[in-house]
């Protein structure tokens, strides 16, 4: 295991005033999976609701790199390759757990955080609101 | 904070043989996430590549319930509401972190685990392989 020198400004797990603290083993199961979605499939380019992948990097967070999808168009690509605005490209979102360093820069002290990420886009029929 | 009595069978953060271990404050940010759009969109029904949500339940994991998307059709729904097999419904996958108690039942020791989940489906143009 890696031993990290104690930073006196970082919290001590024995400290009674520190909020409920647990130990988390970061030797992740299933670690060798591909984290770059561009490498694992080209659906982002072939979809009728294509998206771009933006790298969201934060060294104070684990994982430090998260890929965020942004739909390329408001509409969807039709059979002719044109954007059809009678349909909508929308992001599919997923809530994920991440760890955030807290206090910042402390190598072995984190806080759990839930964040919402856009994973990709799908093409949906719009909801039509009829004026009464 | 809450002090948890030490179970002699549970790992010690000072143990050099224990894999890279960090302290995590469990007072989660964004704990009350019920207002997040993850819960409120009906894209799974309105998509041209609609999907069903299947429950993946594991009481020894957090989150205990994860919803897995399964595309309803091989093809995509066209403007007439029929399945068009010239296009393909495919799952969009995302790697997420989950927490697992390790060793089991130790109240303040967890392991991070990465799992791959299908979040929804998108409609893609098929890859055509030409026979030489």
């Amino acid at each position: 295991g890696i031993t990290i020198p104690r930073n006196p400004g970082c919290p001590n797990s024995e400290d009674k005033n520190f909020p409920r603290t647990v130990m988390v083993n970061l030797n992740i199961h299933n670690r060798n999976t591909n984290t770059n979605p561009k490498r694992s499939s080209d659906y982002y380019n072939r979809s009728t609701s294509p998206w771009n992948l933006h790298r969201n990097e934060d060294p104070e967070r684990y994982p430090s790199v998260i890929w965020e999808a942004q739909c390329r168009h408001l509409g969807c690509i039709n059979a002719d390759g044109n954007v059809d605005y009678h349909m909508n490209s929308v992001p599919i979102q997923q809530e994920i757990l991440v760890l955030r360093r807290e206090p910042p820069h402390c190598p072995n002290s984190f806080r759990l955080e839930k964040i919402l990420v856009s994973v990709g886009c799908t093409c949906v029929t719009p909801i039509v609101h009829h004026v009464q | 904070g809450i002090t948890i009595p030490r179970n002699p069978g549970c790992p010690n953060s000072e143990d050099k043989n224990f894999p890279r271990t960090v302290m995590v404050n469990l007072n989660i940010h964004n704990r009350n996430t019920n207002t997040n759009p993850k819960r409120s969109s009906d894209y799974y029904n309105r998509s041209t590549s609609p999907w069903n949500l299947h429950r993946n339940e594991d009481p020894e994991r957090y989150p205990s319930v994860i919803w897995e998307a399964q595309c309803r059709h091989l093809g995509c729904i066209n403007a007439d509401g029929n399945v068009d097999y010239h296009m393909n419904s495919v799952p969009i996958q995302q790697e997420i972190l989950v927490l697992r108690r390790e060793p089991p039942h130790c109240p303040n020791s967890f392991r991070l685990e990465k799992i791959l989940v299908s979040v929804g489906c998108t409609c893609v143009t098929p890859i055509v392989h030409h026979v030489q």
Epitope: R20, V22, L112 | I2, L26, N27, I28, R31, N32, N34, T35, R39, S40, S41, D42, Y44, N45, L53, R55, E57, D58, P59, E60, R61, Y62, P63, S64, V65, W67, L99, R101, H105, P107
Partner: antibody, heavy 117, light 106 residues
Framework: QVQLVQSGAEVKKPGSSVKVSCKAS????????ISWVRQAPGQGLEWMGS????????NYAQKFQGRVTITADESTSTAYMELSSLRSEDTAVYYC??????????WGQGTLVTVSS | DIQMTQSPSSVSASVGDRVTITCRAS??????LNWYQQKPGKAPKLLIY???SLQSGVPSRFSGSGSGTDFTLTISSLQPEDFATYYC????????FGQGTKVEIK
């Protein structure tokens, strides 16, 4: 099979507090939440709040914020709901339920709390 | 809070009848809707989760449908043990329940 066993009926005076317990038998709490739901006589169901014992995370309905405290003791697999500043309209059956954060799939048998002077 | 409105508030039916109960949410809740059955003096019992999924051990005569704001619980052929009060519940936001529908013997 998960079973939630609640403490017995209570009679309380207005202004006092009540603490109801809910013990999970047939296993530990696991990673689920425990929610508390109440039902006044002849009325519908009302969610009060929840706790995830693994983490100590709590979430309270706005209506009960400041008056309800939900805790859990993992060593005994018991969750507690304490309601303070009791009034007559708090007379109800209080249920604990295992909560996946999507649905309540196992319920305790209920605890009747009567508030009367 | 999301309001859940059930209708009817009570229904009289006979054994073998098809019974339909509806539930409307004050805003879109996707499919995060559950149905419970409660008998007098007993705790509620989960019947349907995620709008249409049958909880294990629940008879197949119970079915759920709907998405967004409008949902339905159907009992295809009412049995003597089905006379009870039924509640819908949303979990798109902090959980809220409908006011209940009592299924009585005609």
């Amino acid at each position: 099979q998960v079973q939630l066993v609640q403490s017995g009926a209570e009679v309380k005076k207005p202004g006092s507090s009540v603490k109801v317990s809910c013990k999970a038998s047939g296993g530990t709490f696991s990673s689920y939440a425990i929610s508390w739901v109440r039902q006044a006589p002849g009325q519908g169901l009302e969610w009060m709040g929840s706790i995830i014992p693994w983490f100590g995370w709590t979430n309270y309905a706005q209506k009960f914020q400041g008056r309800v405290t939900i805790t859990a003791d993992e060593s005994t697999s018991t969750a507690y709901m304490e309601l303070s500043s009791l009034r007559s309209e708090d007379t109800a059956v209080y249920y604990c339920a295992r909560d996946s954060e999507y649905y309540f799939d196992h319920w305790g048998q209920g605890t009747l709390v009567t508030v009367s002077s | 809070d999301i309001q859940m409105t059930q209708s009817p508030s009570s229904v009289s039916a006979s054994v073998g009848d098809r019974v339909t109960i509806t539930c409307r949410a004050s805003q879109g809740i996707s499919n995060w809707l559950n149905w419970y059955q409660q008998k007098p003096g007993k705790a509620p019992k989960l019947l349907i989760y995620a709008a249409s999924s049958l909880q294990s051990g629940v008879p197949s005569r119970f079915s759920g449908s709907g998405s967004g704001t409008d949902f339905t619980l159907t009992i295809s052929s009412l049995q003597p043990e089905d006379f009870a009060t039924y509640y819908c519940q949303q979990y798109s936001d902090d959980p809220t329940f409908g006011q209940g529908t009592k299924v009585e013997i005609k």
